[in-house]
């Protein structure tokens, strides 16, 4: 039975150019976390294998950095970063545990981070 | 230097078994997947069963579920492939391969070695 | 069970050619799509991984794109080297599968 829950920075904003840290946290369950994919929308960013380590798609390697921890770091925003992210938890016994931020870049200064929450 | 060197395979009569080996060397094994794909003659590529570094996971095509036991010794560096209740549609050359990430791409096969059912 | 469809089945085609092969999946498997080029009585070789990575040492002649359903792989100028069959193969879910092939001929 899966008893976890990911905990996720939620909806999130930042500014145009600059850089942003997307993170999720699995609680609640004893399961090993064996690897960890972010996707965004329908495209593999990377993916955080606990033998392995880092693997950040080449097309994304010049924007996108490991961590910290399992998080991973966007930087040079751009409007058309806007949209869903998922941290996709593989673990054992458990199996797979989603998590969604949804990601706002601003062309103003004004970014505010938005509230934690759950996903079950 | 990766290399992959599959073994076991021969003619077999339907009902019987074989078991694959796979002896790995120019990798840390223990931190891979591996992975057991299959081509009868003249057709294409079938998945057929998949294992994750540590051996806690194990995958199978329906085809072979109940018939096939992948496994490996991690100790030894070396994926087996335990083949019961052959059919004469298991004839083909099995190939395994390396799978660095879950959900992932084999970046690294095997020569394949034939499996002939048949009597 | 995730479906892939590869079209053509075979194409004939010439040194220096731009040659297009295309894989559809019956369902959205995201960017979880490979490419492999395997040649007569040898082992399949990796391509392209992630829909549109690269894989180490393969010419840059070789690209991928697509996600979701539909996917491509192209090959900008074919070379003599290139005359193979190949592959997609989804690893969005288990059973993984793989396409029927594309055999690139010589025409």
């Known amino acids: 039975m899966m008893t976890g829950t990911i905990e996720t920075t939620g909806n999130i904003s930042a500014e145009k150019g600059g850089s942003i840290i997307l993170q999720c946290h699995l609680s609640s369950t004893t399961a090993q976390v064996t690897q960890v994919n972010w996707e965004q929308q329908d495209q593999l960013l990377a993916i955080c294998n606990a033998d392995l380590g880092w693997h950040i798609s080449p097309s994304f390697k010049d924007r996108v950095a490991p961590g910290p921890g399992l998080g991973l770091t966007l930087q040079s925003l751009t409007v058309n970063d806007t949209g869903e992210y998922f941290c996709i938890y593989h673990t054992y016994p458990d199996g797979t545990y989603t998590g969604r931020i949804f990601l706002e870049v601003l062309e103003s200064s004004v970014a505010e981070h938005g509230a934690r929450f759950q996903i079950p | 230097e990766v290399q992959l060197l599959e073994s076991g395979g021969g003619l077999v009569q339907p009902g019987g078994s074989l078991r694959l080996s796979c002896a790995a060397s120019?990798?840390?094994?223990?931190?891979?997947?591996m992975t057991w794909v299959r081509q009868a003659p003249g057709k294409g590529l079938e998945w057929v069963s998949a294992i994750s570094g540590r051996g806690s996971s194990t995958y199978y095509a329906d085809s072979v579920k109940g018939r096939f036991t992948i496994s490996r010794d991690n100790s030894k560096n070396t994926l087996y492939l335990q083949m019961n209740s052959l059919r004469a549609e298991d004839t083909a050359v099995y190939y395994c391969?390396?799978?660095?990430?879950?959900?992932?791409?084999?970046?690294?096969w095997g020569q394949g070695t034939l499996v002939t059912v048949s009597s | 069970d995730i479906q892939m469809t590869q079209s053509p089945s075979s194409l004939s085609a010439s040194v220096g050619d731009r040659v297009t092969i295309t894989c559809r999946a019956s369902q959205n498997i995201k960017t979880y799509l490979n490419w492999y080029q395997q040649k007569p009585g040898k082992a399949p070789k990796l391509l392209i991984y992630a829909a549109s990575s690269l894989h180490t040492g393969v010419p840059s002649r070789f690209s991928g794109s697509g996600s979701g359903t539909d996917f491509t792989l192209t090959i900008s100028s074919l070379q003599p080297e290139d005359f193979a069959t190949y592959y997609c193969q989804q690893t969005y879910s288990i059973p993984q599968t793989f396409g029927g092939g594309t055999k690139v001929e010589i025409k």
């Open positions: 391969a390396r799978t660095p990430y879950r959900s992932g791409w084999a970046d690294y």
């Open positions: 120019g990798f840390t094994f223990s931190s891979y997947g």
